[in-house]
């Protein structure tokens, strides 16, 4: 070895100065008698080396680097050797920081593994190999007096947590715990924790389960769920309180919390939920009343609330077949009595024969809003119910009685807009209990089965706005029947359009006769069309060559018209406008020329 480097310190604070010396022995005879020693840090040559010959003939160069700003670098002592640089010796320099105080030390007791897991934040990077040690001792009281030390816990490289196994733990007294960080530049210690491992238990949540239905137990009420939970066995001896959270599976509802709850529940009924709705439920627990950590939420349990029997009023209406009066067509509409009135699975129409106690004969069971059945000859009324898996609605009696009540008068209808019609009447005396309003397409498209109907519960009403199934340019038949206590009045009907169409085209004008100052015109009227209102009048327009216009209004029954006061030998443009309540349409233009003064009249 020709050369040797010595440094003031191989590891320094980042940015601190460092001094190095390189000595070249005299017996390196192949070197120049006065060799020039060069310094290199990493790949860069460093100026400032002070070289001297020592008394024993060796050469020494000393350099001071004012700031070591590399966290790791090689410092080399070199000589020029021909055209290349020959490295005689090199040392590794390290620079960094002493360890910061570890912070946020926290510990959790894992009851499953019976070990205490502590974690911390090591602080900023030191750029130097830094070791962490979790240190602890046993103590009575608040750790002011230090008892026997517990075996150090050394984390694996790069980890900021360490696990003290059960055999080194003290479960029946407090422990003082801290983290020590150490590197070449110094040592630091975290603030000390004083804890009973049981005070920092990491609880696991109970296991939620659905309750197995027992034959004796009553089923849950509508909007209720029956569930139970089993505590996490290792945590049974820790006083805890728990809370449940639930939300509907569908929709954007947020979690609702229920608590505090006991650690164990062999049977728990959760109510106030939406009926017939799927819910997600979770539970978690915390040590109580002493401080602790919440467990994680348990795995989800998914349960569906039972539904409630339908709570609806059923408005009914019926019709008899004209050819077979015992065949009845019954119609109904469910009207919710509450915001959540329950799902309707279907409807049953039934009849209870007199003298047969308890016997109920079903006449029809349907999911539709009407059914047709043969009414037994002795039956005067039937019962209608809506049902689902939870039960039935209150029965609605339907009494089949003849029309014996007074009729309403002055039934009339008028359009409100293209999709609604107002039907009005004068109520009879005495007031009815209500009205049934039916409407559907009038002739020629009329059909009994395609009628829409509504019940008006107010017997004092004098009209009703029809908004369903109304389309413009269609003729509607509207039937109104007053309803009384045990009977009804005769039905009245009226026809109306919600919007009529303007005439689609006006009749073609034809020239019948022409003279020098007059012209006789005629046309064939358009046949009436369904959905188009009748013509109210015609207007005939004529314009001369000087663009002067003239017109005359004619009644709707007109079939022709004579234009008088025309100029001889003049050109005229004539058209007919056919008008109704709904609008007007023009015919095509007829152009004619009156005769010259010398010409003879044409007939």
């Amino acid at each position: 070895e020709c050369g040797h480097i010595s440094v003031s310190a191989p590891i320094v604070h980042l940015g601190d100065p460092i001094t190095a010396s390189c000595i070249i022995k005299q017996n390196c005879s192949h070197l120049d008698p006065e060799p020039q020693i060069l310094w290199r840090l990493g790949a860069e040559l460093q100026p400032g080396g002070r070289q001297q010959r020592l008394s024993d003939g060796t050469q020494e160069s000393i350099i001071t680097l004012p700031h070591l700003n590399h966290t790791q670098a090689f410092l080399s002592c070199c000589l020029n050797w021909g055209n290349s640089l020959q490295i005689l010796d090199q040392v590794e320099l390290r620079a960094g920081y002493p360890p910061a105080i570890p912070h946020n030390l926290s510990c959790l007791m894992n009851l499953t593994t019976s070990s205490l897991i502590c974690q911390w934040e090591p602080g900023p990077e030191t750029h130097l190999p830094t070791s962490f040690t979790l240190k602890s001792f046993k103590s009575r009281g608040n750790c002011q007096t230090q008892g026997d030390s517990i075996l150090d816990c050394v984390p694996k490289d790069g980890q900021s947590h360490c696990c003290i196994p059960r055999k080194h733990l003290l479960l029946y007294q407090n422990m003082g715990i801290w983290v020590q960080a150490e590197n070449a530049l110094g040592t630091s210690m975290s603030p000390q924790l004083c804890l009973d491992p049981m005070d920092v238990v990491k609880l696991e949540p109970p296991m939620l389960r659905t309750m197995d239905p027992s034959p004796e137990a009553a089923p849950p009420q509508a909007g209720c769920l029956q569930l139970c939970w089993e505590p996490w066995q290792p945590g049974l001896h820790i006083n805890q309180k728990c809370e449940l959270r639930h939300k509907p599976q569908r929709g954007e509802a947020s979690w609702a919390l229920v608590g505090p709850l006991p650690l164990e529940a062999l049977q728990y009924e959760l109510c106030g939920l939406l009926p017939a709705t799927a819910y997600t439920l979770q539970i978690r627990c915390i040590r109580w009343p002493l401080p602790g950590h919440w467990s994680d939420w348990s795995p989800s349990l998914e349960l569906r609330t039972t539904e409630r029997a339908p709570t609806v009023r059923l408005d009914t209406w019926w019709r008899q077949r004209q050819l077979d009066p015992r065949t009845v067509q019954l119609f109904w509409k469910p009207v919710p009595l509450e915001e959540d009135s329950g799902r309707i699975q279907g409807y049953v129409v039934s009849w209870r024969p007199s003298g047969q106690a308890g016997a109920i004969l079903p006449l029809c069971n349907t999911t539709e809003l009407s059914c047709t059945f043969h009414l037994p000859s002795e039956a005067q009324e039937v019962a209608l119910v809506a049902y689902n898996s939870a039960g039935t609605s209150r029965p609605t009696p339907v009494v089949f009685s003849e029309s014996r009540g007074p009729a309403l008068t002055r039934l009339h209808a008028m359009a409100r807009d293209p999709h609604s019609l107002w039907v009005g009447w004068e109520p009879p005396n005495p007031w009815p209990q209500g009205y049934v309003i039916e409407w559907g397409l009038g002739p020629p498209s009329a059909s009994n089965s395609n009628k829409t109907w509504r019940m008006e519960q107010n017997g004092r009403a004098t009209g009703f706005l029809l908004k369903e199934n109304i389309r413009p340019f269609q003729l509607y038949e509207i039937i109104v029947t007053p309803l009384y206590q045990d009977t009804m009045g005769p039905s009245q009907h009226v026809y109306a359009y919600s919007q009529e169409m303007a005439p689609s085209h006006a009749p073609e004008l034809h020239l019948k006769h022409i003279g020098k100052t007059w012209a006789q015109l005629e046309w064939v009227p358009e046949p009436p069309e369904l959905g188009k209102s009748p013509l109210t009048h015609y207007t005939i327009f004529w314009t001369n060559a000087q663009n002067q216009s003239f017109s005359a209004i004619l009644n709707a029954s007109s079939r022709g018209f004579v234009l008088h006061g025309l100029e001889p030998a003049s050109l005229y443009h004539i058209h007919l406008m056919a008008a109704s309540q709904a609008g007007a349409t023009n015919s095509t233009v007829l152009t004619l020329m009156t005769l010259t003064p010398e010409g003879s009249e044409l007939h």
Partner: antibody, heavy 118, light 107 residues
């Protein structure tokens, strides 16, 4: 000198309740776990329940879980055992014990007899 | 819960005999095993804690050994005052279960 003195035992009918007390002296009560152990006539020792120094940890034997409640009042240096829904098989001498730092029952009271009979 | 099984349930011995009682835990409990002595009509008394540590005031003829699941209490030379019932107890976990007891009687 450590002393533990139980009281509150006696005769009670099945389904009835009793509350046992254990007055402690001679040591810093609030720093130590405490426990109850019972011994039925002619039988071995049966651990009943223990309680941590702060009162937050209260394990019970399966045979008494849900019926017995252990508690402590550190200001009065007293340990309690509330016994409800008593059964004939709960008849025993009940001992109170002070636990050491490794869970050993270092000191015991003289015991109090509980008899459950109709 | 950890179950403790003691054997034998009783034994007869003479003064001066060496007596061995064993205790087995249903799962590993490290060294958290304690031994008690009880004489008729008296409260139990702690003899040995943490498997092998003699409680203050207990004669040195009593010794304990073992770790994990198998433990032994040995009385090296039985004395007249040692005729009693001996119990083991675990303190590894909080359900501080006792063994069924071993009654040492005079032969």
């Amino acid at each position: 000198e450590v002393q533990l003195l139980e009281s509150g035992g006696g005769l009670v009918q099945p389904g009835g309740s009793l509350r046992l007390s254990c007055a402690a002296s001679g040591f810093t009560f609030s720093l130590y776990w405490m426990g109850w152990v019972r011994q039925a006539p002619g039988k071995g020792l049966e651990w009943v329940s223990s309680i941590s120094s702060s009162g937050g940890v209260t394990p019970y034997a399966d045979s008494v879980k849900g019926r017995f409640t252990i508690s402590r009042d550190n200001s009065k240096n007293t340990l309690y055992l509330q016994m409800n829904s008593l059964r004939a098989e709960d008849t025993a001498v009940y001992y109170c014990a002070k636990l050491g730092e490794l869970g050993q029952m270092m000191y015991w009271g003289q015991g109090t007899l509980v008899t459950v009979s109709s | 819960d950890i179950q403790m099984t003691q054997s034998p349930s009783s034994l007869s011995a003479s003064v001066g005999d060496r007596v061995t009682i064993t205790c087995r835990a249903s799962q590993g409990i490290s060294s958290y095993l304690n031994w008690y002595q009880q004489k008729p009509g008296k409260a139990p008394k702690l003899l040995i804690y943490y498997a092998s540590n003699l409680q203050n005031g207990v004669p040195s003829r009593f010794s304990g050994s073992g770790s994990g699941t198998d433990f032994t209490l040995t009385i090296s030379s039985l004395q007249p005052e040692d005729f009693a019932t001996y119990y083991c107890q675990q303190s590894w976990m909080y359900a501080h279960m006792f063994g069924g007891g071993t009654k040492v009687e005079i032969k």
